[in-house]
């Protein structure tokens, strides 16, 4: 009973600096209560970007502080990453593990390259 | 750097309770599973149980379920075992472990806390 | 239950030489969700590898790991002196997280 997760391979983020993408999973058991994690791998380091625990049925929910936002449909998330920059350019993985009830199922995407350019400062311009 | 220290082992008689902490300290507690591993003399590893995150979800093995309780405090960095009905076959050391990054395996472990029941 | 089977139970080698341990689950381990600890009398277990085959930090590289689905492998290129330990299997695709009995590799 593995647990299958799939993400896009690549995301470009918007001049704004906002990228979104599914994390869709297969779950073998009927869970009540998903745990949602985007981890940012680069140059070896990994670093954790946003959790979101939430119950089926209900939207996700970030910490106010979080630079993620997302909402949820059976067993696919919609992530959105905001405030991006180009150094935030890297693999952004999406971890999904069945929290509730027993037993518990880990699942890890393969990842999406997100693609992060800083927009060019517009020009002055003399009138 | 990471550490976690257990304490609460000792000698009791079997039905009897027993109590295990684990400080943590090196690390944001609250993002990680935490859990309890255990090893009977001479023998190989146990996992006993986990409480993930925020403290809601807990996971038991089948030997412990319905006598053994873990709980945390994010607030002291304090994981907890609370273990009731204790029998022989719980004699042990009891370890705290840090569920890894990327899933529930332990990258880091306490030094352990021998339990032994015993009338 | 994912029942985990560790092979040989011991392994005599000399420093120096190569070390092949095997584990082997009941079914699959969904994946790659398989870690490897070295445990040396009295102290705590150590993380070797994590996802079958990623070395865990500050794990020296005659470390490898291999495998998928159900067989697995746990190789030591050369063995030093400090290597003399005993190993354990785990997976952790899905609860119960449950360990192999062990391989205990020592000096011949």
């Known amino acids: 009973k593995a647990m299958h997760v799939a993400q896009p391979a690549v995301v470009l983020a918007s001049s704004r600096g906002i990228a979104s993408f599914v994390c869709e999973y297969a779950s073998p058991g009927k869970a009540t209560e998903v745990r949602v994690t985007v981890l940012r791998q680069a140059d070896s380091q990994v670093t954790e970007v946003c959790a979101a625990t939430y119950m089926m049925g209900n939207e996700l929910t970030f910490l106010d502080d979080s630079i993620c936002t997302g909402t949820s449909s059976g067993n696919q998330v919609n992530l959105t990453i905001q405030g991006l920059r180009a150094m935030d350019t890297g693999l952004y993985i999406c971890k999904v593990e069945l929290m509730y009830p027993p037993p518990y199922y880990l699942g890890i995407g393969n990842g999406t390259q997100i693609y992060v350019i800083d927009p060019e400062p517009c020009p002055d311009s003399d009138f | 750097q990471v550490q976690l220290v257990e304490s609460g082992g000792g000698v009791v008689q079997p039905g009897r309770s027993l109590r295990l902490s684990c400080i943590a300290s090196?690390?944001?507690?609250?993002?990680?599973?935490m859990h309890w591993v255990r090893q009977a003399p001479g023998k190989g590893l146990e996992w006993v149980a986990v409480n993930w995150y925020d403290g809601s979800n807990k996971h038991y093995a089948d030997s412990v379920k319905g006598r053994f309780t873990i709980s945390r405090d994010n607030s002291k960095n304090t994981l907890y075992l609370q273990m009731n009905s204790l029998r022989a076959e719980d004699t042990a050391v009891y370890y705290c472990?840090?569920?890894?990054?990327?899933?529930?395996?332990?990258?880091?472990w306490g030094q352990g806390t021998l339990v032994t029941v015993s009338s | 239950e994912i029942v985990l089977t560790q092979s040989p139970g011991t392994l005599s080698l000399s420093p120096g030489e190569r070390a092949t341990l095997s584990c082997r689950a009941s079914?699959?381990?969904?994946?790659?969700?398989l870690a490897w600890y070295q445990q040396k009398p009295g102290q705590a277990p150590r993380l070797l590898i994590y996802?079958?085959?990623s070395r865990a930090t500050g794990i020296p590289d005659r470390f490898s790991g291999s495998g998928s689905g159900t067989d697995f492998t746990l190789t030591i290129s050369r063995l030093e002196p400090e290597d003399f330990a005993v190993y354990y299997c785990?997976?952790?695709?899905?609860?119960?997280?449950?360990f192999g009995p062990g391989t205990k590799v020592d000096i011949k």
């Open positions: 996802g079958a085959s």
């Open positions: 785990q997976q952790y695709g899905s609860s119960p997280f449950t």
């Open positions: 079914q699959s381990v969904s994946s790659s969700y």
């Open positions: 090196g690390f944001t507690f609250s993002s990680y599973g």
């Open positions: 472990a840090r569920g890894g990054v990327w899933g529930p395996y332990f990258d880091y």
